[in-house]
C-alpha cells in the first residue's frame, strides 16, 4: 500500500505516461500552413505532461508508441463552402528532425466542416509534430471544436 501511495505521488512523466492535450492558439502567417497550439492548466482543459511546445508545435520527449488524435472545425465553412474552396486538407506529420520527416495523418474536409481522426504511431524523443491546414478556410478556436493531443501508450 505504501508503494501504491508513493506511485500516486510520482509525476505522470516519470511513469512513462507522457500525454498532451492542446487547443488552437492561431494560424500561421501568410505562406505558413501550420496551426499553432497552446496548452496548460491556465487555459482550462489543456495540459502537457512530458511533451512540450516549441513555438506552437508539439515536441516529444520520450520514445514510444503514441496515440495521436486531432479534431479541427472550420469556423468559416459550409458543405458547399468546403467544396468550393477545395482542397482544404489537414495533415499531421513529423516535421523535424528532417531525417524523420513523414506524414502521419491526412484528411480532407470534402463536404463537411469538421474532421477528426486518430492513429497509433511510433514517435521518438526530439520528434516535432506539425499540423498543416491547407486551403483558405479558417479554423475555429473554440476549445470543444478544435483540439490536438498525444498519449504515450507503450515503449
Amino acid at each position: 500500500q505504501r508503494f501504491a501511495q508513493a506511485q500516486q505521488q510520482l509525476p505522470l512523466e516519470s511513469l512513462g505516461w507522457d500525454v498532451a492535450e492542446l487547443q488552437l492558439n492561431h494560424t500561421g502567417p501568410q505562406q505558413d500552413p501550420r496551426l499553432y497550439w497552446q496548452g496548460g492548466p491556465a487555459l482550462g482543459r489543456s495540459f502537457l505532461h512530458g511533451p512540450e511546445l516549441d513555438k506552437g508545435q508539439l515536441r516529444i520527449h520520450r520514445d514510444g508508441i503514441y496515440m495521436v488524435h486531432i479534431q479541427v472545425t472550420l469556423a468559416i465553412c459550409s458543405s458547399t463552402t468546403a467544396s468550393r474552396h477545395h482542397p482544404t486538407t489537414l495533415a499531421v506529420g513529423i516535421c523535424s528532425p528532417a531525417s524523420r520527416s513523414i506524414s502521419l495523418l491526412r484528411l480532407s474536409f470534402h463536404q463537411g466542416c469538421t474532421i477528426a481522426s486518430q492513429r497509433l504511431t511510433p514517435l521518438a524523443r526530439g520528434d516535432t509534430l506539425c499540423t498543416n491546414l491547407t486551403g483558405t478556410l479558417l479554423p475555429s478556436r473554440n476549445t470543444d471544436e478544435t483540439f490536438f493531443g498525444v498519449q504515450w501508450v507503450r515503449p
Epitope: H26, T27, P29, I76, C113, T136, P139, S140, R141
Partner: antibody, heavy 120, light 108 residues
Framework: EVQLLESGGGLVQPGGSLRLSCAAS????????MSWVRQAPGKCLEWVST????????FYAESVKGRFTISRDNSKNTLYLQMNRLRAEDTAVYYC?????????????WGQGTLVTVSS | EIVLTQSPGTLSLSPGERATLSCRAS???????LAWYQQKPGQAPRLLIY???SRATGIPDRFSGSGSGTDFTLTISRLEPEDFAVYYC?????????FGCGTKVEIK
C-alpha cells in the same frame, strides 16, 4: 477599449476608385479576422468581404468579386478596402467589423461607418 | 446563399411589453450559427446574441435568443425605452454571410 474608425469615403463617379481604411485600437489586431459590411440608405445590411488575421485568407461577396480587394497591415493596425470600377449600387455606408476571437463571422465590434456615394 | 426572412417588418409596442421577433432561414443554419444585432438611427449595429442563444458581453438579460435549424426567435421580455430600434439577424455558418432585412420595434 476596442475602437474601429473608418475613413476614406466620399463622392466618386461611376467607374471610379476609392480606398477605405479602418484604424483599429484597443486589441491585438493581428489575432482577429476582420470584415467590411455595407448598408445602402434605408436598406438591409450586406456582407462585403472578410480577411483572416494573418491576411492569408480572403473572402468576397459575389457582387464585389473582382472589383474590391480587402487587405490589412498588421504593423499599422489598419484594415483596407480597395474599391475599383464602382457602380451606383455600391452607394452605402461601409462599416468595418471585428470577428469573434474564435474566427466565427459574427461581429462583436463595429466602426461608425463611412459613406460612399457613387454618382455622376 | 441562405436567405433570412424577418417578421414582422414593424412591431408597435409599449414600454414594459414583451417583443417577439422571428427570423426564418431558407435552409438549415449550421450549428445554430445565428446572431442578432440592434441598430439605432445613425449608429452602427450592436451585437446582442450569437450562437442563436448566447448573450454578448454587457447585454441585459431581458434579451434572449432561441431556435435552431431554420427558425429563430429574439425575445425582449420587457421593453425599455432604449430598446426601440431595428433588429437584424445574421447567419455565419455559410458563405456568403447573410443578414435579414430587419424588424423595426417602434413605440405604440
Amino acid at each position: 477599449e476596442v475602437q474601429l474608425l473608418e475613413s476614406g469615403g466620399g463622392l466618386v463617379q461611376p467607374g471610379g476608385s476609392l480606398r477605405l481604411s479602418c484604424a483599429a485600437s484597443g486589441f491585438t489586431f493581428s489575432v482577429y479576422a476582420m470584415s467590411w459590411v455595407r448598408q445602402a440608405p434605408g436598406k438591409c445590411l450586406e456582407w462585403v468581404s472578410t480577411i483572416s488575421g494573418s491576411g492569408g485568407s480572403t473572402f468576397y461577396a459575389e457582387s464585389v468579386k473582382g472589383r474590391f480587394t480587402i487587405s490589412r497591415d498588421n504593423s499599422k493596425n489598419t484594415l483596407y478596402l480597395q474599391m475599383n470600377r464602382l457602380r451606383a449600387e455600391d452607394t452605402a455606408v461601409y462599416y468595418c467589423a471585428r470577428h469573434d476571437y474564435s474566427n466565427y463571422a459574427y461581429f462583436d465590434y463595429w466602426g461608425q461607418g463611412t459613406l460612399v456615394t457613387v454618382s455622376s | 446563399e441562405i436567405v433570412l426572412t424577418q417578421s414582422p417588418g414593424t412591431l408597435s409596442l409599449s414600454p414594459g411589453e414583451r417583443a417577439t421577433l422571428s427570423c426564418r432561414a431558407s435552409q438549415s443554419v449550421r450549428s445554430s450559427y445565428l446572431a442578432w444585432y440592434q441598430q439605432k438611427p445613425g449608429q452602427a449595429p450592436r451585437l446582442l446574441i450569437y450562437g442563436a442563444s448566447s448573450r454578448a458581453t454587457g447585454i441585459p438579460d431581458r434579451f434572449s435568443g432561441s431556435g435552431s435549424g431554420t427558425d429563430f426567435t429574439l425575445t425582449i421580455s420587457r421593453l425599455e425605452p432604449e430598446d426601440f430600434a431595428v433588429y437584424y439577424c445574421q447567419q455565419y455558418g455559410d458563405l456568403p454571410f447573410t443578414f435579414g432585412c430587419g424588424t423595426k420595434v417602434e413605440i405604440k
